[in-house]
Amino acid sequence: MMTGTIETTGNISAKKGGSVILQCHLSSTMAQVTQVNWEQHDHSLLAIRNAELGWHIYPAFKDRVAPGPGLGLTLQSLTMNDTGEYFCTYHTYPDGTYRGRIFLEVLESSVAEHSARFQIP
Protein backbone atom coordinates (compact mmCIF):
# COMPACT_ATOMS: atom_id res chain seq x y z
CA MET A 1 0.00 0.00 0.00
CA MET A 2 1.32 3.43 -0.98
CA THR A 3 1.14 5.67 2.08
CA GLY A 4 3.57 8.38 1.03
CA THR A 5 2.90 11.85 -0.29
CA ILE A 6 5.01 14.07 -2.53
CA GLU A 7 5.42 17.65 -1.42
CA THR A 8 6.60 20.05 -4.11
CA THR A 9 7.44 23.69 -4.51
CA GLY A 10 4.07 23.97 -6.28
CA ASN A 11 3.52 26.98 -8.54
CA ILE A 12 6.64 29.13 -8.72
CA SER A 13 7.78 32.11 -10.70
CA ALA A 14 11.24 33.36 -11.55
CA LYS A 15 12.64 35.98 -13.83
CA LYS A 16 14.11 35.46 -17.27
CA GLY A 17 17.86 34.92 -17.11
CA GLY A 18 17.66 33.89 -13.48
CA SER A 19 17.66 30.47 -11.86
CA VAL A 20 15.17 28.40 -9.92
CA ILE A 21 15.30 25.36 -7.66
CA LEU A 22 12.86 22.56 -8.47
CA GLN A 23 12.34 20.56 -5.31
CA CYS A 24 10.19 17.59 -4.33
CA HIS A 25 10.08 15.77 -1.02
CA LEU A 26 8.63 12.35 -0.30
CA SER A 27 7.15 11.97 3.17
CA SER A 28 4.92 9.65 5.22
CA THR A 29 6.56 6.48 3.96
CA MET A 30 9.46 4.29 4.97
CA ALA A 31 9.99 3.23 1.34
CA GLN A 32 13.52 3.40 -0.02
CA VAL A 33 14.00 5.89 -2.86
CA THR A 34 15.97 4.13 -5.58
CA GLN A 35 15.75 6.75 -8.30
CA VAL A 36 14.30 10.18 -9.00
CA ASN A 37 13.53 11.31 -12.54
CA TRP A 38 12.97 14.94 -13.51
CA GLU A 39 10.89 15.59 -16.61
CA GLN A 40 9.90 18.71 -18.48
CA HIS A 41 6.42 19.67 -19.72
CA ASP A 42 6.91 17.83 -23.02
CA HIS A 43 7.86 14.74 -20.97
CA SER A 44 11.50 14.91 -22.06
CA LEU A 45 13.95 13.92 -19.36
CA LEU A 46 15.98 16.63 -17.70
CA ALA A 47 17.86 14.40 -15.29
CA ILE A 48 17.96 11.10 -13.43
CA ARG A 49 19.32 10.71 -9.93
CA ASN A 50 20.01 7.11 -9.01
CA ALA A 51 20.52 6.61 -5.27
CA GLU A 52 23.80 4.74 -5.76
CA LEU A 53 25.05 5.79 -9.18
CA GLY A 54 24.53 9.53 -8.85
CA TRP A 55 23.29 11.98 -11.47
CA HIS A 56 22.68 11.76 -15.19
CA ILE A 57 22.04 15.16 -16.77
CA TYR A 58 20.60 15.09 -20.28
CA PRO A 59 22.90 16.66 -22.87
CA ALA A 60 20.35 19.20 -24.05
CA PHE A 61 20.31 20.68 -20.55
CA LYS A 62 23.88 20.08 -19.37
CA ASP A 63 24.82 23.77 -19.52
CA ARG A 64 21.68 24.95 -17.74
CA VAL A 65 20.89 22.27 -15.19
CA ALA A 66 22.83 21.76 -11.97
CA PRO A 67 22.15 18.73 -9.78
CA GLY A 68 20.81 19.43 -6.31
CA PRO A 69 20.28 20.55 -3.74
CA GLY A 70 19.57 17.03 -2.52
CA LEU A 71 17.28 15.24 -4.94
CA GLY A 72 16.21 18.55 -6.44
CA LEU A 73 17.37 20.31 -9.56
CA THR A 74 18.56 23.86 -10.22
CA LEU A 75 17.51 25.29 -13.58
CA GLN A 76 19.68 28.20 -14.68
CA SER A 77 19.68 30.92 -17.38
CA LEU A 78 15.90 30.74 -17.60
CA THR A 79 14.14 31.57 -20.86
CA MET A 80 10.46 32.16 -21.55
CA ASN A 81 10.35 28.69 -23.12
CA ASP A 82 11.04 27.18 -19.70
CA THR A 83 7.55 28.16 -18.58
CA GLY A 84 5.44 25.07 -17.99
CA GLU A 85 5.06 21.93 -15.95
CA TYR A 86 7.89 19.93 -14.40
CA PHE A 87 7.48 16.49 -12.90
CA CYS A 88 9.50 14.63 -10.31
CA THR A 89 9.03 10.87 -10.35
CA TYR A 90 10.20 8.97 -7.28
CA HIS A 91 10.90 5.28 -7.85
CA THR A 92 10.70 3.58 -4.48
CA TYR A 93 10.88 0.12 -2.99
CA PRO A 94 8.55 -1.44 -2.05
CA ASP A 95 5.89 1.24 -2.63
CA GLY A 96 6.37 1.85 -6.34
CA THR A 97 6.21 5.20 -8.12
CA TYR A 98 5.25 8.60 -6.73
CA ARG A 99 4.89 11.65 -8.96
CA GLY A 100 4.89 15.34 -8.13
CA ARG A 101 4.12 18.37 -10.27
CA ILE A 102 5.61 21.86 -10.28
CA PHE A 103 4.46 24.73 -12.48
CA LEU A 104 7.14 27.26 -13.36
CA GLU A 105 6.29 30.65 -14.80
CA VAL A 106 9.19 32.60 -16.23
CA LEU A 107 8.54 36.33 -16.11
CA GLU A 108 10.02 39.11 -18.23
CA SER A 109 9.59 41.57 -15.39
CA SER A 110 12.73 42.60 -13.55
CA VAL A 111 10.69 42.75 -10.38
CA ALA A 112 9.60 39.12 -10.65
CA GLU A 113 9.92 37.54 -7.25
CA HIS A 114 10.97 33.91 -7.05
CA SER A 115 8.18 32.64 -4.87
CA ALA A 116 8.42 29.07 -3.73
CA ARG A 117 6.57 27.22 -1.04
CA PHE A 118 6.16 23.54 -0.36
CA GLN A 119 2.71 22.20 -1.04
CA ILE A 120 1.03 18.88 -1.65
CA PRO A 121 -0.16 18.74 -5.26
Epitope: T34, Q35, E39, H43, S44, L45, I48, N50, A51, E52, L53, G54, W55, H56, I57, Y58, P59, A60, K62, P67, H91
Partner: antibody
Framework: QVQLVQSGAEVKKPGASVKVSCKAS????????MHWVRQAPGQRLEWIGG????????SYSQKFQGRATLTVDTSASTAYMELSSLRSEDTAVYYC????????????WGQGTTVTVSS | DIQMTQSPSSLSASVGDRVTITCQAS??????LAWYQQKPGKAPKLLIY???YRYTGVPSRFSGSGSGTDFTFTISSLQPEDIATYYC?????????FGGGTKLEIK
Protein backbone atom coordinates in the same frame (compact mmCIF):
# COMPACT_ATOMS: atom_id res chain seq x y z
CA GLN B 1 44.62 10.13 -21.72
CA VAL B 2 42.04 8.01 -19.92
CA GLN B 3 43.00 4.35 -19.58
CA LEU B 4 41.50 1.40 -17.76
CA VAL B 5 43.93 -1.50 -17.47
CA GLN B 6 42.63 -4.82 -16.18
CA SER B 7 44.35 -7.78 -14.56
CA GLY B 8 45.18 -10.91 -16.52
CA ALA B 9 43.17 -13.99 -17.43
CA GLU B 10 42.06 -16.34 -14.67
CA VAL B 11 41.17 -20.04 -14.59
CA LYS B 12 39.05 -21.09 -11.62
CA LYS B 13 37.34 -24.20 -10.29
CA PRO B 14 33.58 -24.25 -9.73
CA GLY B 15 32.73 -22.89 -6.28
CA ALA B 16 35.84 -20.71 -6.13
CA SER B 17 36.01 -16.90 -6.21
CA VAL B 18 37.77 -14.55 -8.58
CA LYS B 19 38.86 -10.94 -8.06
CA VAL B 20 39.50 -8.81 -11.13
CA SER B 21 41.25 -5.45 -10.86
CA CYS B 22 40.96 -2.35 -13.02
CA LYS B 23 43.62 0.37 -12.75
CA ALA B 24 42.40 3.81 -13.84
CA SER B 25 44.70 6.53 -15.12
CA UNK B 26 44.32 9.85 -16.89
CA UNK B 27 41.50 11.04 -14.65
CA UNK B 28 40.50 11.17 -10.99
CA UNK B 29 38.81 7.87 -10.19
CA UNK B 30 36.40 9.45 -7.69
CA UNK B 31 34.83 11.65 -10.40
CA UNK B 32 33.20 8.86 -12.40
CA UNK B 33 31.10 5.85 -11.55
CA MET B 34 32.77 2.55 -12.42
CA HIS B 35 30.77 -0.34 -13.84
CA TRP B 36 31.40 -3.96 -14.58
CA VAL B 37 29.96 -5.68 -17.63
CA ARG B 38 30.52 -9.24 -18.75
CA GLN B 39 30.17 -11.08 -22.02
CA ALA B 40 29.88 -14.85 -22.16
CA PRO B 41 31.01 -16.48 -25.43
CA GLY B 42 28.63 -15.51 -28.22
CA GLN B 43 26.31 -13.72 -25.78
CA ARG B 44 25.11 -10.16 -25.29
CA LEU B 45 26.74 -7.76 -22.88
CA GLU B 46 25.47 -8.10 -19.32
CA TRP B 47 25.66 -5.39 -16.66
CA ILE B 48 26.87 -6.70 -13.29
CA GLY B 49 26.74 -3.44 -11.34
CA GLY B 50 28.32 -0.09 -10.67
CA UNK B 51 30.10 1.69 -7.86
CA UNK B 52 30.25 5.40 -7.18
CA UNK B 53 33.74 5.87 -5.71
CA UNK B 54 32.87 9.34 -4.46
CA UNK B 55 30.19 8.17 -2.04
CA UNK B 56 30.87 4.44 -2.04
CA UNK B 57 27.35 3.58 -3.22
CA UNK B 58 26.95 0.35 -5.15
CA SER B 59 24.19 -0.87 -7.43
CA TYR B 60 24.01 -4.50 -8.50
CA SER B 61 21.93 -6.39 -11.00
CA GLN B 62 19.65 -8.68 -9.01
CA LYS B 63 21.22 -11.61 -10.83
CA PHE B 64 24.59 -10.88 -9.18
CA GLN B 65 23.39 -9.51 -5.85
CA GLY B 66 25.12 -11.37 -3.02
CA ARG B 67 27.65 -12.99 -5.34
CA ALA B 68 29.42 -9.96 -6.80
CA THR B 69 31.24 -7.39 -4.70
CA LEU B 70 32.43 -4.11 -6.18
CA THR B 71 35.06 -2.06 -4.37
CA VAL B 72 37.41 0.82 -5.12
CA ASP B 73 40.78 1.67 -3.63
CA THR B 74 40.88 5.39 -4.34
CA SER B 75 44.50 5.76 -3.18
CA ALA B 76 45.57 3.21 -5.80
CA SER B 77 43.05 4.43 -8.43
CA THR B 78 41.92 0.83 -8.78
CA ALA B 79 38.50 -0.76 -8.92
CA TYR B 80 37.83 -4.41 -8.10
CA MET B 81 35.13 -6.90 -8.93
CA GLU B 82 34.96 -10.10 -6.91
CA LEU B 83 32.62 -12.89 -7.98
CA SER B 84 32.09 -15.83 -5.64
CA SER B 85 30.56 -19.31 -5.93
CA LEU B 86 31.71 -19.56 -9.51
CA ARG B 87 29.97 -21.90 -11.92
CA SER B 88 30.68 -22.81 -15.53
CA GLU B 89 28.13 -20.25 -16.77
CA ASP B 90 30.35 -17.51 -15.31
CA THR B 91 32.95 -18.21 -17.99
CA ALA B 92 33.12 -14.86 -19.77
CA VAL B 93 35.13 -11.76 -20.55
CA TYR B 94 34.70 -9.23 -17.74
CA TYR B 95 35.05 -5.53 -18.52
CA CYS B 96 35.40 -2.55 -16.26
CA UNK B 97 33.97 0.59 -17.80
CA UNK B 98 33.33 4.06 -16.51
CA UNK B 99 30.32 6.26 -17.08
CA UNK B 100 30.81 9.79 -18.34
CA UNK B 101 30.77 12.75 -15.95
CA UNK B 102 27.12 13.36 -15.01
CA UNK B 103 26.05 10.83 -17.64
CA UNK B 104 25.26 7.12 -17.57
CA UNK B 105 26.65 6.04 -20.94
CA UNK B 106 29.92 4.09 -20.81
CA UNK B 107 32.69 6.09 -22.45
CA UNK B 108 35.90 4.22 -21.58
CA TRP B 109 36.40 0.46 -21.25
CA GLY B 110 39.15 -1.80 -19.99
CA GLN B 111 40.64 -4.37 -22.36
CA GLY B 112 38.69 -7.18 -20.70
CA THR B 113 39.68 -10.07 -18.44
CA THR B 114 38.88 -13.61 -19.46
CA VAL B 115 37.64 -15.75 -16.59
CA THR B 116 37.32 -19.47 -17.29
CA VAL B 117 35.48 -21.68 -14.83
CA SER B 118 36.27 -25.31 -15.36
CA SER B 119 36.70 -28.40 -13.23
CA ASP C 1 13.94 -5.69 -15.97
CA ILE C 2 13.70 -3.72 -19.21
CA GLN C 3 14.19 -5.99 -22.21
CA MET C 4 16.01 -4.61 -25.24
CA THR C 5 15.18 -6.28 -28.55
CA GLN C 6 17.58 -5.52 -31.35
CA SER C 7 17.03 -6.33 -35.00
CA PRO C 8 18.26 -7.70 -37.23
CA SER C 9 20.64 -10.01 -35.39
CA SER C 10 22.91 -10.01 -38.42
CA LEU C 11 23.05 -8.25 -41.73
CA SER C 12 25.19 -8.20 -44.83
CA ALA C 13 25.67 -4.97 -46.77
CA SER C 14 27.96 -3.48 -49.40
CA VAL C 15 30.45 -0.67 -48.97
CA GLY C 16 28.58 2.62 -49.45
CA ASP C 17 25.22 1.18 -48.39
CA ARG C 18 22.96 2.86 -45.86
CA VAL C 19 22.55 0.51 -42.90
CA THR C 20 19.80 0.74 -40.28
CA ILE C 21 19.57 -1.17 -37.00
CA THR C 22 16.60 -0.92 -34.65
CA CYS C 23 16.26 -1.40 -30.92
CA GLN C 24 12.99 -1.74 -29.06
CA ALA C 25 12.62 -1.34 -25.30
CA SER C 26 9.97 -3.26 -23.37
CA UNK C 27 8.91 0.00 -21.68
CA UNK C 28 9.36 3.74 -22.09
CA UNK C 29 13.00 4.70 -21.53
CA UNK C 30 12.70 8.29 -22.82
CA UNK C 31 16.06 8.90 -24.51
CA UNK C 32 18.19 6.92 -22.04
CA LEU C 33 19.87 4.86 -24.74
CA ALA C 34 23.42 4.45 -26.02
CA TRP C 35 24.89 2.57 -28.99
CA TYR C 36 28.25 0.76 -28.96
CA GLN C 37 30.48 -0.81 -31.58
CA GLN C 38 32.43 -3.95 -30.74
CA LYS C 39 35.06 -5.52 -32.94
CA PRO C 40 36.16 -9.16 -32.40
CA GLY C 41 38.40 -9.56 -29.36
CA LYS C 42 38.04 -5.91 -28.41
CA ALA C 43 36.07 -3.92 -25.85
CA PRO C 44 32.96 -2.03 -26.96
CA LYS C 45 33.31 1.62 -28.01
CA LEU C 46 30.71 4.30 -27.36
CA LEU C 47 29.27 5.77 -30.57
CA ILE C 48 25.96 7.42 -29.64
CA TYR C 49 24.66 8.61 -26.27
CA UNK C 50 21.26 9.88 -25.13
CA UNK C 51 19.73 8.31 -28.26
CA UNK C 52 20.99 10.89 -30.76
CA TYR C 53 24.24 12.53 -29.61
CA ARG C 54 27.40 11.49 -31.42
CA TYR C 55 30.28 10.81 -29.05
CA THR C 56 33.54 12.75 -29.43
CA GLY C 57 35.54 11.65 -32.47
CA VAL C 58 32.82 9.44 -33.92
CA PRO C 59 32.46 9.92 -37.71
CA SER C 60 29.36 11.78 -38.92
CA ARG C 61 28.16 8.75 -40.91
CA PHE C 62 26.96 7.28 -37.59
CA SER C 63 23.70 8.62 -36.21
CA GLY C 64 20.95 7.67 -33.81
CA SER C 65 17.34 8.65 -33.30
CA GLY C 66 14.23 7.74 -31.36
CA SER C 67 12.68 8.09 -27.93
CA GLY C 68 10.29 6.13 -25.75
CA THR C 69 10.46 2.53 -26.89
CA ASP C 70 11.70 2.66 -30.49
CA PHE C 71 15.23 3.59 -31.51
CA THR C 72 17.22 3.54 -34.72
CA PHE C 73 20.94 3.47 -35.40
CA THR C 74 22.11 4.38 -38.91
CA ILE C 75 25.35 4.20 -40.84
CA SER C 76 24.77 6.51 -43.82
CA SER C 77 27.53 5.05 -45.98
CA LEU C 78 29.06 1.77 -44.87
CA GLN C 79 32.86 1.63 -44.72
CA PRO C 80 35.00 -1.54 -44.50
CA GLU C 81 36.17 -0.55 -40.99
CA ASP C 82 32.55 -0.55 -39.78
CA ILE C 83 32.47 -4.34 -39.75
CA ALA C 84 31.62 -5.11 -36.13
CA THR C 85 28.79 -6.01 -33.79
CA TYR C 86 26.60 -3.14 -32.60
CA TYR C 87 24.76 -3.05 -29.28
CA CYS C 88 22.11 -0.79 -27.82
CA UNK C 89 22.08 -0.13 -24.06
CA UNK C 90 19.35 1.31 -21.84
CA UNK C 91 20.34 3.20 -18.70
CA UNK C 92 16.90 4.49 -17.76
CA UNK C 93 16.68 2.21 -14.78
CA UNK C 94 18.78 -0.49 -13.15
CA UNK C 95 19.56 -3.18 -13.96
CA UNK C 96 21.00 -1.63 -17.10
CA UNK C 97 20.41 -3.91 -20.06
CA PHE C 98 21.79 -4.39 -23.57
CA GLY C 99 20.32 -5.52 -26.84
CA GLY C 100 21.33 -8.87 -28.30
CA GLY C 101 23.62 -7.24 -30.84
CA THR C 102 23.66 -6.87 -34.61
CA LYS C 103 26.57 -8.45 -36.45
CA LEU C 104 27.41 -6.45 -39.54
CA GLU C 105 29.22 -8.08 -42.45
CA ILE C 106 30.39 -6.88 -45.86
CA LYS C 107 28.79 -8.45 -48.91
Amino acid sequence: QVQLVQSGAEVKKPGASVKVSCKASGYTITENTMHWVRQAPGQRLEWIGGINPNQGGTSYSQKFQGRATLTVDTSASTAYMELSSLRSEDTAVYYCTRSSYYRYDLDYWGQGTTVTVSS
Amino acid sequence: DIQMTQSPSSLSASVGDRVTITCQASQDIKTALAWYQQKPGKAPKLLIYSASYRYTGVPSRFSGSGSGTDFTFTISSLQPEDIATYYCHQHYTTPWTFGGGTKLEIK
